[in-house]
Amino acid sequence: LIIGFGISGRHSITVTTVASAGNIGEDGILSCTFEPDIKLSDIVIQWLKEGVLGLVHEFKEGKDELSEQDEMFRGRTAVFADQVIVGNASLRLKNVQLTDAGTYKCYIITSKGKGNANLEYKTGAFSMPEVNVDYNASSETLRCEAPRWFPQPTVVWASQVDQGANFSEVSNTSFELNSENVTMKVVSVLYNVTINNTYSCMIENDIAKATGDIKVTESEIKRRSHLQLLNSKAS
């Protein structure tokens, strides 16, 4: 969490941002809130990116104002116009690109004063893994697949019964480049699995950590997946 305060002249206002991560090819949100004003027409929101000449987005007098917008953000940005009045200056970003990563500044002017806060935005690819029993294999084998990751993640297997065991010798992980030549499909196979045990396939890079669990008993198979973004810090 980054909390910024206004500078000279008028009173300062508090602006708060949260570091976040964007999944390339999907839509992202850069979070920013501020002390609200009574009149929408008195609020100016400017989003800037370090190293970029033009603006990312500007909203003033109740409307978007993109005359100074940088070409790389054309057609890809919007604020939540109906929420600006309550202090939400968060930015919607369409079709997140790797090059969108960097330091952004959320700069606010209201009748109460000015304020700004920076936000670190990471970009990459992350997806939920799915673990299945590989019935084609000669021995009891599990197959963990996740369609989109970038940068290349690490894959670690764990089991409830053999806690702390190292499965690197009995697993094999491969990374297959997807058609857009950036993200990769992750496939990891675990051999010699035993029944009545819960196995976890953990995929992690510097942006996200995802886990796919599978519990195999004689009567049923139970699966569970979850994904967690790393380093979501507020400013």
């Epitope: 090819g25 999907e26 409307k63 104002e65 005359s67 057609g75 919007a78």
Partner: antibody, heavy 121, light 107 residues
Framework: QLQLQESGPGLVKPSETLSLTCTVS??????????WSWIRQHPGKGLEWIGN???????YYNPSLRSRVTMSVDTSKNQFSLKLSSVTAADTAVYYC?????????????WGQGTLVTVSS | DIQMTQSPSTLSASVGDRVTITCRAS??????LAWYQQKPGKAPKLLIY???SLESGVPSRFSGSGSGTEFTLTISSLQPDDFATYYC?????????FGGGTKVEIK
């Protein structure tokens, strides 16, 4: 409500420049929340997006036509224009102007009624 | 450029039928897809935006679904006024592109 109307010559000679204007009524072209587009449709065929313009004059053109396209805007007349140079018979089409829904969502609504431009000597 | 492929190109149906048109993108476009209806000699009319949002004034028999690369437009009960050509369009990234169209004709 917002209405768009295309105007310009219906016949253009090969190698010349096609010029069309879109007049906006019922709203301001200077509303910063929208991009303004040109789209064309060859006879009996599908739709092709030509490009868009913002009220400040910034443009984006479809790379397939970029070398021949120029768009401009006249906020005082509430109009935006399209010029397509070095035309051939392949540029014969119905030309539409349209507004995007927002700065981030460029589904098109409303559209002008379209104007047929024939390229022939 | 992102290629948009519609199927079928022609569809014969009767009043009251449930009609489904498919649009496939050559790469993921998230939910940035619109559907239009066009009648001969007229401009296209926006039906659906953002894959599933119904444009104001469009009858509720029209619905859109899908995300990523696969999308569908469904007309729950075809009416006489619905015989037309339908186009999908992606606005995920420049240059914006349209599908080739699906003509819905009377069986």
């Amino acid at each position: 409500q917002l209405q768009l109307q295309e105007s310009g010559p219906g016949l253009v000679k090969p190698s010349e420049t096609l010029s069309l204007t879109c007049t906006v009524s019922g709203g301001s072209i200077s509303d910063g929340s929208y991009y303004w587009s040109w789209i064309r449709q060859h006879p009996g065929k599908g739709l092709e997006w030509i490009g868009n313009i913002y009220y400040s004059g910034s443009t984006y053109y479809n790379p397939s036509l970029r070398s021949r396209v120029t768009m401009s805007v006249d906020t005082s007349k509430n109009q935006f224009s399209l010029k397509l140079s070095s035309v051939t018979a392949a540029d014969t089409a119905v030309y539409y102007c349209a507004r995007g829904l927002s700065t981030i969502d460029e589904a098109f609504d409303p559209w002008g009624q379209g104007t047929l431009v024939t390229v022939s000597s | 450029d992102i290629q948009m492929t519609q199927s079928p190109s022609t569809l014969s149906a009767s009043v009251g039928d449930r009609v489904t048109i498919t649009c496939r993108a050559s790469q993921s476009i998230s939910s940035w897809l619109a559907w239009y209806q066009q009648k001969p000699g007229k401009a296209p009319k926006l039906l659906i935006y953002k894959a599933s949002s119904l444009e104001s004034g469009v009858p509720s028999r029209f619905s859109g679904s899908g995300s990523g690369t696969e999308f569908t437009l469904t007309i729950s009960s075809l009416q006489p006024d619905d015989f037309a050509t339908y186009y999908c369009q992606q606005d995920n990234s420049y240059p914006y592109t349209f599908g080739g169209g699906t003509k819905v004709e009377i069986k």
